[in-house]
Amino acid sequence: QPPPPPPDATCHQVRSFFQRLQPGLKWVPETPVPGSDLQVCLPKGPTCCSRKMEEKYQLTARLNMEQLLQSASMELKFLIIQNAAVFQEAFEIVVRHAKNYTNAMFKNNYPSLTPQAFEFVGEFFTDVSLYILGSDINVDDMVNELFDSLFPVIYTQLMNPGLPDSALDINECLRGARRDLKVFGNFPKLIMTQVSKSLQVTRIFLQALNLGIEVINTTDHLKFSKDCGRMLTRMWYCSYCQGLMMVKPCGGYCNVVMQGCMAGVVEIDKYWREYILSLEELVNGMYRIYDMENVLLGLFSTIHDSIQYVQKNAGKLTTTIGKLCAHSQQRQYR
Amino acid sequence: SAYYPEDLFIDKKVLKVAHVEHEETLSSRRRELIQKLKSFISFYSALPGYICSHSPVAENDTLCWNGQELVERYSQKAARNGMKNQFNLHELKMKGPEPVVSQIIDKLKHINQLLRTMSMPKGRVLDKNLDEEGFESGDCGDDEDECIGGSGDGMIKVKNQLRFLAELAYDLDVDDAPGNSQQATPKDNEISTFHNLGNVH
């Protein structure tokens, strides 16, 4: 083993290096000192480091570490942040277009329903948006509310246009009859199934992306322990105390230190791998009724079909509802 | 049969066109994200190596620093850390992850469970029995466009293809197109040199 070179007799090199780290020279000894107060860079002989310098080295070492982590995650972080934003915006656009499609269907097929239908459709798709973004709304309730709201308008405007449309009493009765008589057949159930499945998957997809950002942010801004700071200082800076400005840490030694410093972070690995593969599995399953783009953009057609179904059975329904809601209707006609 | 609105066009700022003749869909964008994400599968296991390779480490030099002294690069002392009587590296590892890391691991476990629960077996098709009166949705064969069940002639096929080219304008009131979302971009040359360390020689 080669003998260590004699330390710089004046600590001049150490001073010029340390000046970059900490302007002002008062912490660097003029000449090598015993360094008995040092806690990290324990000297084998005279040293050009002081306790204050050690502290500064530790701070810098931990800062270096944080910067290196941020540099490592830069592309990954951008990838997830960018995609989370893109998908969120794209999903909102899909919802808006689904709403416009549905409104267009009402305008072109059932103009007499439009003012109120637009309002109910708007409320439904607002809830859809909120649900995707994590709001605590029940999809079945959303769909029920849409059909509950639509039926009184359909009944009074399409099936029984002679009725005055201002009476709240019959509306309440019609809302109840809608479910009891299954006036829209199984269409509400069909829509519930499709919408809830596609929205659930969409919501968890966005949640997963946002968690991905959180995972990267956590490791990006990790504060390293004092022990780790000391190990890093010893590896990166203690050689300067001996005037060894040109020497670099041994590769194997660096790996050992990093494994010590990052033991906790590396524990994320197993779950991170699982996260990527589980997300891939989810994405592979996002088609047909698990694809909100597919489901929402087809809703206008299913809603149209449900109204046609009501119209097809209008005679039978009018008679039944006439009896069921007779009391409300009598009050209205007075 | 229902009035079918025109083809859907969407703001190209949201998703860019990959090929003019093969417009980018949400599903293709999702697949692209997954393919790129998979290249980061070793991100956490490779971090210690990344830090070492991006900080000053002796590569071609004969001598290197082992924390206590100057040693020959391939000697046994090169890998041994010069930390006797200081603190135990093994102890440092045994402390377990920081609370913030433990928290994020718990969140990952939770989302992984949710993702697995939500991942649907392939090839599952929507039930056709729509109501007791027996009308049913048309068949959606694998080779056809994806479709939504509806009644008889009212059933339409929905092309699963958002063309991200221009915002559709209806003859009825539609919402405004979304503004361009701000995107984080890397600062030029950010962290390209080791903090106050790289060029001291």
Partner: antibody
């Protein structure tokens, strides 16, 4: 140290196929994408496709879909590319490259394999 | 495909000088650009990825910048070992595409 060692130069007649290899070392083979790139004489680089040893998935440039087949032998950490129906147009240097870890960019490359198709 | 228009195709420079190469993408590539140095008989060597992130072991004389569709790559304080062909690569799209290359020669 990350290394990608490619098989030696080959000279083949037009018609049949040729299989070139890319043996890797210094990293966990299954964790990184292996890409293949073509460089015709005096020309730029052209991406052929990739294979992911983790799950065996592949993705091709449409231009090479019927020309190249990418395979793996995970036990020896080796990737292969087979080129079929060879013509003089296929004469080029072919590179394998690794991607992943901290970027989707190709971060380590093999030295290249020269393929000459001549009758 | 995304086209990458690289310029100039060749470049003469003096030792100690500075050179700049540019790449223009046919559409926004979201900073997903890498720069390579290629010497005869060897595989290309990655210098910079994600617009400006320097690879380990690459001197800080090399730098990259840009955004959207326009990107540039510079070498300052030119050294003899920098003589090579340089390529840009876009990896925003899954179909990776390279620039045509810039051959750097000594004056």
């Amino acid at each position: 140290e990350v290394q990608l060692q490619q098989s030696g130069p080959v000279m083949v007649k037009p018609g049949p196929s040729v299989k070139i290899s890319c043996q890797t070392s210094g990293f966990t083979f299954t964790d990184y994408y292996i890409h293949w790139v073509k460089q015709s004489h005096g020309k730029s680089l052209e991406w052929i496709g990739l294979v992911f040893p983790y799950d065996g998935g592949t993705n091709y440039n449409q231009k090479f879909k019927d020309k190249a087949t990418l395979t793996l032998d995970t036990s020896s950490s080796t990737a292969y590319m087979e080129l079929n129906s060879l013509t003089s147009e296929d004469s080029a240097v072919y590179y394998c490259a690794r991607a992943g870890g901290f970027s989707y960019a190709l971060n380590y490359w093999g030295q290249g394999t020269s393929v000459t198709v001549s009758s | 495909d995304i086209q990458m228009t690289q310029s100039p195709s060749s470049l003469s420079a003096s030792l100690g000088g500075k050179v700049t190469i540019t790449c223009k993408a046919s559409q926004d590539i979201n900073n997903y650009i890498a720069w390579y140095q290629h010497k005869p008989g060897k595989g290309p060597r990655l210098l910079i990825h994600f617009t400006s992130t320097l690879q380990p072991g690459i001197p800080s004389r090399f730098s990259g910048s840009g955004s959207g569709r326009d990107y540039s790559f510079s070498i300052s304080n030119l050294e003899p070992e920098d003589i090579a062909t340089y390529y840009c690569l876009q990896y925003d799209n899954l179909l990776l595409t390279f620039g045509a290359g810039t051959k750097l020669e000594l004056k």
